[in-house]
């Protein structure tokens, strides 16, 4: 055993001076040699029979929510299904896991990335990566040309997740789409109305929504010379300038892609604007851009979803910004992304650089490619990065040392005196029976201090509290927790008065 | 059990050159790590070089690096130390040492020694 | 390089006493240190790696303690065959380097 335990102790020595070089950025080989030690170490250390045979933990990139995480992540929800429903969308749901075929094509390099099952009696079948590419399917395979759903539940991604950012291999997106034939432009700017609404209630801090499209970048490439077999890794590099420098992103564009100089100039020239419609009017005027009828289309449209966001009162928080170049493989028009101008970070605390938090555009092309006939549905759609959300929620609570009601109990029935589980247990029931969240201590005879003690931990506003005089008078006594303050209450009242109370509808409609 | 046993030791002039051996047995020889730790008259000890079991890694103490070289015969179960441009303060007891748990940096098992005398 | 600095030097003591003898490092180590046992015209003898590990076969009266910059080596009750040179070893980084020795001498 003691031999047994010093090689554990070499084992995590090594792992720590392993650790220790990739941080100081020590020689290839030194670090090559002392992992290879590290490996050596851990193979004479075999398997402990002693201890379990696998180490409890939740599979990478996955965790548990606790029910303070719960209590955060159901308030973001209803913020966000809320708004859903007030822009009059249904909701669907689909399974878990598709055919692979379904999922096959539709997301280019990132294919890579999808979860497959082993066989499962001859169906090949892959967890979804998203919600969209099944909402297309759904569209095609029950014919429908008109929906407006959403929907939320978890995806899967064979990502290396930083999960301290918000990122997970099993994460939720809430989605939102409109499909159908519309006139140009009035369901992309409810889109972007609905984003901005949710970002917005959910208080995360101040964002930008960043809008391209397609058809302009498209457009764009050609113009300044482009090949169309470049097309997409050169997107890649253009998408990079809201992290590094455009000397960089050249750098990288004739470096690495073979681009011609004076071609990633005349990229550079376009993709470092930004703007408002004032850039939309100045690109329809440049002679080269709107002479490309990709580029037009897409400009008069940008055009036109301006005005409509002016109306929607939320054109101060879109910028049109032409290096917006990311999730194209599907995308045929407009695309968006909401970006934090800056986390809310207290004193002292890092900012949690959780990049985007929601992202969307429109997609015309999808439902065709599962249609025998390739019939189209145009489509148009959103999707909030909860788990982003989630962490900074959870960080700003931390950081404010904020309570947060992880259950919603509106009254204990507590006793006073000895042998009163009988009556506790009817009171309960009754309120139950009346729509009252209400709770009582499994104990027989509970002293009063840790009934109210409990009450004070798990932030429950009333205690109902049953006593031999209060039964001879029929009354209960009702106690606020926070002002301590007791009143009588006629039995026959105690469920109307809890409900006005705790602002609760007095009946359950 | 395991064993190690220098040889080559003897007396050379400075400039001279010398090759000391260390026999092993007992042991998976190729597994190992094997160091050179070289110990002058009543004085302290030295780690002078050392190599790893697949014969990948090698290093040597500045005061030896450009005239020592370590190397191993894992068919032969044998260590060498080539010792060129010899100076008087090379003269030593050298051992040859078996890092413990193949690869951590600390003889576990040690040879008898071989003495170096390095005079004019 | 990493210096060890060992003290004392040298010490004085009868069978039956606790001896401690401390290693210093220039830098910190964390637990890569080991301690070494020599008798005149003999190879040392290795008594305790990363820093408490007793080396199998060694008496448990011989315990090791310490991480970072500061170790010990402690003979719990000292018996004759323990008369020697004590010397500890850094194992962090090449070139890996050795204290000055302690004599452990009878009083």
């Known amino acids: 055993m003691a031999e047994r335990a010093a090689l554990e102790e070499l084992v995590k020595l090594q792992g720590e001076r392993v650790r220790g070089l990739k941080q100081q950025k020590a020689s290839a080989e030194l670090i090559e040699e002392e992992v290879a030690k590290l490996l050596k170490l851990k193979a004479q250390l075999g398997p402990d029979e002693s201890k379990q045979k696998f180490v409890l933990k939740t599979p990478k990139g996955t965790r548990d929510y606790s029910p303070r995480q719960m209590a955060v992540r159901e308030k973001v929800f209803d913020v966000i299904i809320r708004c859903f429903k007030r822009h009059g969308a249904e909701v669907i749901d689909t399974p878990v896991f598709e055919l692979k075929e379904t999922l096959m094509g539709k997301y280019g390099e990132d294919s890579k990335l999808i979860y497959d099952l082993k066989d499962q009696g001859g169906e090949l079948l892959s967890l979804r990566y998203d919600l969209t590419v099944p909402f297309a399917r759904y569209l095609a395979m029950n014919k429908l040309t008109n929906i407006k759903r959403y929907h939320i539940a978890k995806v899967y991604r064979r990502d290396n997740p930083a999960m301290t950012r918000g990122r997970y291999r099993e994460f939720y997106q809430c989605d939102f789409d409109i499909a159908g034939n519309f006139d140009p432009m009035i369901p992309d700017a409810e889109c972007l109305k609905i984003m901005c609404e949710i970002l917005s209630s959910l208080q995360i801090g101040d964002f930008l929504v960043k809008v391209n499209d397609r058809r302009i970048l498209d457009g764009m490439f050609a113009i300044c010379g482009v090949s169309d077999s470049k097309f997409r890794t050169i997107c890649s590099s253009v998408d990079k300038l809201d992290k590094v420098s455009w000397e960089e992103v050249k750098n990288e564009m004739v470096g690495e892609k073979g681009l011609a100089p004076e071609v990633a100039d005349r990229i550079g020239d376009y993709v470092q604007q930004h703007g408002g419609v004032s850039l939309v009017e100045q690109l329809l005027q440049d002679p080269k851009l709107s002479q490309n009828k990709q580029a037009l289309e897409g400009l008069g449209d940008l055009k036109l979803l301006f005005e409509y966001l002016t109306l929607f009162g939320i054109d101060d928080k879109i910028s049109f910004d032409l290096s917006l170049a990311r999730g194209l493989d599907y995308y045929t028009g407009v695309i968006y992304e909401a970006v934090l101008l800056q986390t809310p970070a207290q004193a002292g605390e890092e900012p949690l650089g959780v990049g985007s938090v929601a992202a969307g555009g429109r997609y015309d092309g999808l439902v065709g490619m599962f249609d025998p006939k390739g019939r189209k549905v145009p489509c148009v759609g959103l999707s909030i990065g909860v788990e982003r959300i989630f962490s900074i929620v959870e960080q700003r609570l931390e950081a404010l040392e904020e309570k947060i009601r992880t259950t919603e109990t509106q009254v204990l029935v507590a006793s006073a005196q000895k042998k009163l589980l009988e009556e506790r247990l009817k009171l309960v029931s009754e309120l139950w029976d009346a729509g009252i969240k209400a709770e009582l201590l499994y104990k027989k005879n509970p002293k009063l201090l840790n009934q109210l003690q409990y009450c004070e931990e798990a932030g429950i506003p009333l205690v109902a509290i049953i006593g031999e005089q209060e039964l001879k008078d029929g009354v209960i006594k009702l106690r606020s927790v926070t002002s301590r303050e007791e009143v009588d209450v006629r039995r026959e009242d105690l469920v109307e008065e809890i409900k006005r109370r705790t602002g609760q509808p007095l009946c359950i409609c | 059990q395991v064993q190690l046993v220098e040889s080559g030791g003897g007396l050379v002039k400075p400039g001279g050159s010398l090759r000391l051996s260390c026999a092993a047995s007992?042991?998976?020889?190729?597994?190992?790590?094997m160091t050179w730790i070289r110990q002058a008259p009543g004085k302290g000890l030295e780690w002078v070089s050392y190599?790893?079991?697949?014969?990948?890694?090698?290093d040597y103490a500045d005061s030896v690096k450009g005239r020592f070289t370590i190397s191993r015969d894992n068919a032969k179960n044998s260590l060498y130390l080539q010792m060129n441009s010899l100076r008087d303060e090379d003269t030593a007891v050298y051992f040859c040492a078996r890092y413990v748990y193949q690869v951590v940096a600390i003889g576990d098992y040690w040879g008898q020694g071989t003495l170096v005398t390095v005079s004019s | 390089d990493i210096q060890m600095t060992q003290s004392p030097s040298s010490v004085s003591a009868s069978v039956g006493d606790r001896v401690t003898i401390t290693c210093r490092a220039s830098q910190g180590i964390s637990s890569w240190l080991a301690w070494y046992q020599q008798k005149p015209g003999r190879a040392p003898k290795l008594l305790i790696f990363?820093?408490?590990s007793l080396q199998s076969g060694v008496p448990s009266r011989f315990s090791g303690s310490g991480s970072g910059t500061h170790f010990t080596l402690t003979i719990s009750s000292l018996q004759p065959e323990d008369f020697a040179t004590y010397y500890c070893q850094q194992a962090k980084s090449f070139p890996y380097t050795f204290g000055q020795g302690t004599k452990l001498e009878i009083k």
């Open positions: 007992g042991f998976t020889f190729s597994d190992y790590y």
């Open positions: 990363a820093a408490s």
């Open positions: 190599i790893s079991g697949s014969n990948a890694y090698t």
